[in-house]
């Protein structure tokens, strides 16, 4: 079945239950999500606007998707598997009398469970576990996941262990204005942009000349050198750095456990040993991902390749390739391409190139 | 690449029995929830009938609840619809479309056959 | 059970135009709403899932707003092929169409 292919998880309460108090409905919420982050790397944030990876929503009878509620008693409540849309999210019976505590049907109890299929899990046969199919009362407050319940998550999402530090090669800092430097990867951070070069990025904020050198283990103990590409979902906080068939994925500039994976799991074949240079653009929901003279778009709301790639980059963005090193996305309609010591500002509205610069031009060389 | 290839559609008399059958290939087909959607002559589309992943969970729309089936052989790759006590209000392309992985049908129908047309008339 | 009803019925546009059609759901659907193009002939193609979001292959200049109650399909520079009938939808129930047809 389904998984979410991220460890960054969003969360949005639509609407509140009148049967508590809206701090409850948001604490019982909250410490059902924690249930499942403390025994996975799944990290959940809640956010009040915006389109969320999980939906919590109450409602009566018919509300939107085929599995109208049953009125008081019967079913409590509904969850879809990970995915876009109406996927993750979980629906609760507002006919249901909705607690705290044992009298009603405790919310607390009944989201451990629906969050449990919300994030892929399906019903267990043990009367233990708490994705057992029927309901049935247990103290909160000593309240643990079955044995069961934790082999079942923890076979889709590993366990919350740190990964093992990766060494750096020894290589010498790069003069940031040798007119023929280049670079492994480029991506924005939020108002920054980083710029990677073996084991060193440069940090550039945004309208500002200064720029900053740091050694990538500096502040990512765990990554490698080399970063071969990298992208940003700003609306996320979620920046992925890729080399060889690997990436990595950070969240809230800080890398998330059970990295690196497989670049295989975005959908490439088997061919595609690594990634050249990888793009978001939040305008589509897409990310662009170069290799070699190629590139493959993909959907990062369905979490799938989209069909009819690869592509060739000389056919479809004019003037850039055959092959780039790296590319990011800035000001709404640019995709700024590097290709050696040489810079491409791209208007990807017009679909074509509006500037040629130096790669290191963004440092007032 | 996803392929949905309906079948078994024709002319049959009020009162008779249809089966139309939907071939799938390019997909899990055991994955994922399966729909009819009809569109009689000229008119709007409407929902006929969802079958759950495994086939243990079935929906059906009022206008034909009680006089048609819908069932799935996830080792043939085909899902099917069973017309009894058909009407002349039955008369319609129907349509086979996949919805999502998944305990529950979202509704998302992101795959469509290219129909296959079904006539009841005397 | 929830109504979905979708204006205008048919509509008159020009290439190159912006058109918007609506759809109103009789409750609150949140954002379970999906709009789908359907030509002549041919089966319903998916647009726009979710409300607003385009699903693979579909041409940027269509989008998707709305949540609760109302939703609105924007084509934001009509092209030749984009005359078609237009269906919004949620779970089983799909609004009566618009056809939009050239001027």
């Known amino acids: 079945g389904p998984v979410w292919r991220k460890h960054y998880i969003t969360y949005r309460i639509n609407n509140y239950t009148p049967d508590m108090n809206r701090e409850d409905v948001d604490y019982a919420i909250r410490k059902a999500f924690q249930v499942w982050s403390n025994v996975t790397p799944l990290k959940f944030s809640k956010i009040n606007t915006g389109m969320a990876d999980i939906l919590v929503v109450f409602a009566r009878g018919a509300h939107g998707d085929f599995h109208a509620f049953d009125g008081k008693g019967g079913i409590l409540a509904h969850a879809f598997g990970p995915g876009s849309g109406i996927g993750g999210d979980a629906h609760f019976d507002e006919d249901e009398f909705w607690t705290t505590h044992s009298g009603g049907t405790n919310l607390f109890l009944t989201a451990v469970h629906e969050i449990g299929h919300s994030l892929g899990l399906g019903h267990s046969s043990d009367p233990k576990a708490v994705m057992f199919p029927t309901y049935k009362y247990v103290d909160i407050n000593t309240f643990r996941l079955s044995a069961d319940d934790i082999r079942g998550i923890q076979s889709l999402y590993g366990d919350p262990k740190e990964n093992q530090r990766l060494p750096n090669p020894d290589n010498s800092e790069p003069a940031l204005c040798d007119p023929n430097l280049s670079f492994d990867a480029v991506t924005t951070v939020g108002n920054k942009i980083f710029f990677f070069k073996d084991r060193f990025f440069w940090l550039k904020v945004s309208e500002r000349p200064k720029t900053s050198v740091n050694l990538i283990s500096s502040l990512w103990p765990t990554l490698p050198s080399g970063i071969e590409a990298a992208y940003e979902i700003e609306a996320r906080n979620q920046v992925f750095l890729f080399k060889d068939d690997k990436y990595w994925l950070i969240s809230n500039l800080r890398p998330e456990p059970n990295y690196p994976k497989s670049i295989h799991s975005f959908g490439f074949p088997n061919f595609v040993k690594k990634i050249d240079a990888a793009v978001f653009n939040p305008r589509f929901y897409r990310t662009y991902f170069f290799v070699d003279n190629q590139y493959w778009r993909y959907d990062e709301r369905r979490q799938m390749m989209d069909p009819g790639y690869p592509k060739l980059i000389t056919k479809n963005f004019q003037g850039i390739g055959p092959k780039i090193d790296a590319v990011f996305y800035s000001k709404n309609k640019y995709y700024y391409f590097f290709q050696g010591s040489n810079q491409f500002e791209y208007d990807f509205l017009l679909q074509r190139i509006t500037k040629t610069l130096k790669s290191n031009s963004w440092f007032g060389c | 690449e996803v392929q949905l290839l309906e079948s078994g559609g024709g002319l049959v008399q009020p009162g008779g029995s249809l089966r139309l059958s939907c071939a799938a290939s390019g997909f899990t087909f055991s994955d994922y929830w399966m729909h009819w959607v009809r569109q009689a002559p000229g008119k709007g589309l409407e929902w006929v009938s969802g079958?759950?992943?495994?086939?243990?969970?079935?929906m059906y729309a009022d206008s034909v609840k009680g006089r048609f089936t819908i069932s799935r052989d996830n080792s043939k790759n085909t899902l099917y619809l069973q017309m009894n006590s058909l009407r002349a209000e039955d008369t319609a392309v129907y349509y086979c479309a996949r919805d999502i992985v998944g305990p529950y049908s979202a509704g998302l129908f992101d795959y469509w056959g290219r129909g296959t047309l079904v006539t009841v008339s005397s | 059970d929830i109504q979905m009803t979708q204006s205008p019925s048919s509509l008159s546009a020009s290439v190159g135009d912006r058109v918007t059609i609506t759809c109103r759901a009789s409750?609150?659907?949140?954002?379970?709403l999906n709009w789908y193009q359907q030509k002549p002939g041919k089966a319903p193609k998916l647009l726009i899932y979710?409300?607003?979001s385009l699903q693979s292959g579909v041409p940027s200049r269509f989008s998707g707003s709305g949540s609760g109650t109302d939703f609105t399909l924007t084509i934001s520079s009509l092209q030749p092929e984009d005359f078609a009938t237009y269906y919004c939808?949620?779970?089983?129930?799909f609004g009566q169409g618009t056809k939009l047809e050239i001027k």
């Open positions: 409750q609150s659907i949140y954002t379970y």
């Open positions: 939808q949620q779970a089983g129930i």
């Open positions: 079958i759950s992943p495994s086939g243990g969970m079935t």
């Open positions: 979710a409300a607003s």
